[in-house]
């Protein structure tokens, strides 16, 4: 097991998850750790505890390894980091990779007020409701590098979007969370259409793909006090 030392260390590796950092309960996920071609061992840590290791074969000139989690559960959801060893030296820790398990327990309802098709500048609010006890709700936009939002609430949360712009158009889903890394099933999608303005056309996403595997996320700061944490939502984290 890696010995902590603040002396000489190698550059930190890059860690990412494929196909996504959001994994349906029971599905598999690959965690990649990219270090150096000279690395003799990679170690993966989960919530600060040693999780797995791999010793690359010298015959393969690869600077990364893949750790395979065969069945994602609430027990494997959380924060992962990796290290690598080259010679006698260990690298610094990678940035944290936060894996979320979805598809737990129940499915929330999502709706939008006043309606799914609104004019540019109109005030819009999303509502997410989940019957089972939860304390936090997440609203996600498909295919967006726009922000994910979260709100605290018992059974229901509202997400005021303010006066909408064209950037708000797209398809949304919400989740209830049982902790930061264990989420409900996704709601049915709600597509927000924006009309009026210069182009005066209903703008919905042209890409019909709605698989979570293709979503990109960013976490915004809001009144709940959560700071923006791009490492959580980017598939790859570095620097």
């Amino acid at each position: 097991q890696r010995i902590n030392t603040e002396k000489e260390t190698l550059p930190k590796p890059i860690i990412w998850a494929k196909p996504s950092i959001m994994v349906t309960n029971g599905n598999s996920v690959n965690i990649w750790c990219q270090g150096a071609q000279s690395a003799s061992e990679y170690q993966l840590y989960f919530e600060g505890s040693f999780f797995a290791l791999e010793r690359p074969k010298p015959s393969r000139s690869m600077n990364k390894v893949r750790f395979f989690i065969s069945q994602m559960t609430s027990h494997t959801a959380g924060i992962y980091t990796c290290f690598y060893q080259s010679g006698e030296l260990w690298s610094k820790s990678s940035n944290p990779l936060k894996l979320v398990v979805t598809g737990l327990y129940d499915t929330p309802n999502l709706w939008v007020y006043p309606r799914p098709e609104v004019t540019l500048g109109e005030n819009v609010t999303f509502f997410c409701q989940l019957k089972t006890a939860t304390s936090k709700f997440f609203l996600l936009k498909e295919r967006g590098s726009n922000h994910i939002q979260n709100k605290y609430g018992n059974i229901q949360a509202e997400f005021p979007m303010g006066p909408v712009t064209r950037a708000h158009r797209g398809t949304y889903r919400c989740f209830g969370s049982y902790n930061d890394y264990a989420w409900s099933f996704p709601s049915e999608p709600v597509t927000l259409l924006i009309t009026g303005g210069v182009e005066n056309s209903s703008l919905a996403p042209t890409d019909p793909t709605s698989s979570l595997d293709y979503w990109e996320f960013d976490l915004s700061t809001n009144e709940s006090g959560l700071q923006k944490d791009s490492a959580f939502w980017d598939h790859t984290t570095q620097n």
């Epitope: 395979f68 065969s70 494997t76």
Partner: nanobody
């Protein structure tokens, strides 16, 4: 579905040896990474040793390094734990566990990674 059945446990004197076996059912054994864990009375389950699916890379807990050896026979769908120089503190129920399927030469140390477990076999070390 994978079923794991441990055998070979028993009572032994300090300094003695035992070999535990874990027989796996199904055709997925060759694609499984395997591990041994143990749980002493009143204590949490702890990692003992693990082996990768293909080339047989191994990893051991510091407490057993140099005394225990993990190995596998893919033709027999069996993983072994050879235990020697046994001590009183090795007394525990020993569990075999599998990660099915897995990839490459991953060696899993954390119990959360394992998705199949045996029922355990008791090892008692006493004079």
């Amino acid at each position: 579905e994978v079923q794991l059945v441990e055998s070979g446990g028993g009572e032994v004197q300090p300094g003695g040896s035992l070999r535990l076996s874990c027989a796996a059912s199904g055709r997925t054994f060759a694609s499984a990474a395997m591990g041994w864990f143990r749980q002493a009375p009143g204590k949490e389950r702890e990692f003992v040793a693990a082996i990768s699916r293909s080339v047989g890379d191994t990893y051991y807990a510091d407490s057993v390094k140099g005394r225990f050896t993990i190995s596998r026979d893919n033709a027999k769908n069996t993983v072994y734990l050879q235990m020697s120089s046994l001590r009183a503190e090795d007394t525990a129920v020993y569990y075999c566990a599998a990660v099915v399927p897995t990839y490459g030469n991953n060696i899993y140390v954390h119990s959360a990674a394992y998705n199949y477990w045996g029922q355990g076999t008791l090892v008692t070390v006493k004079p």
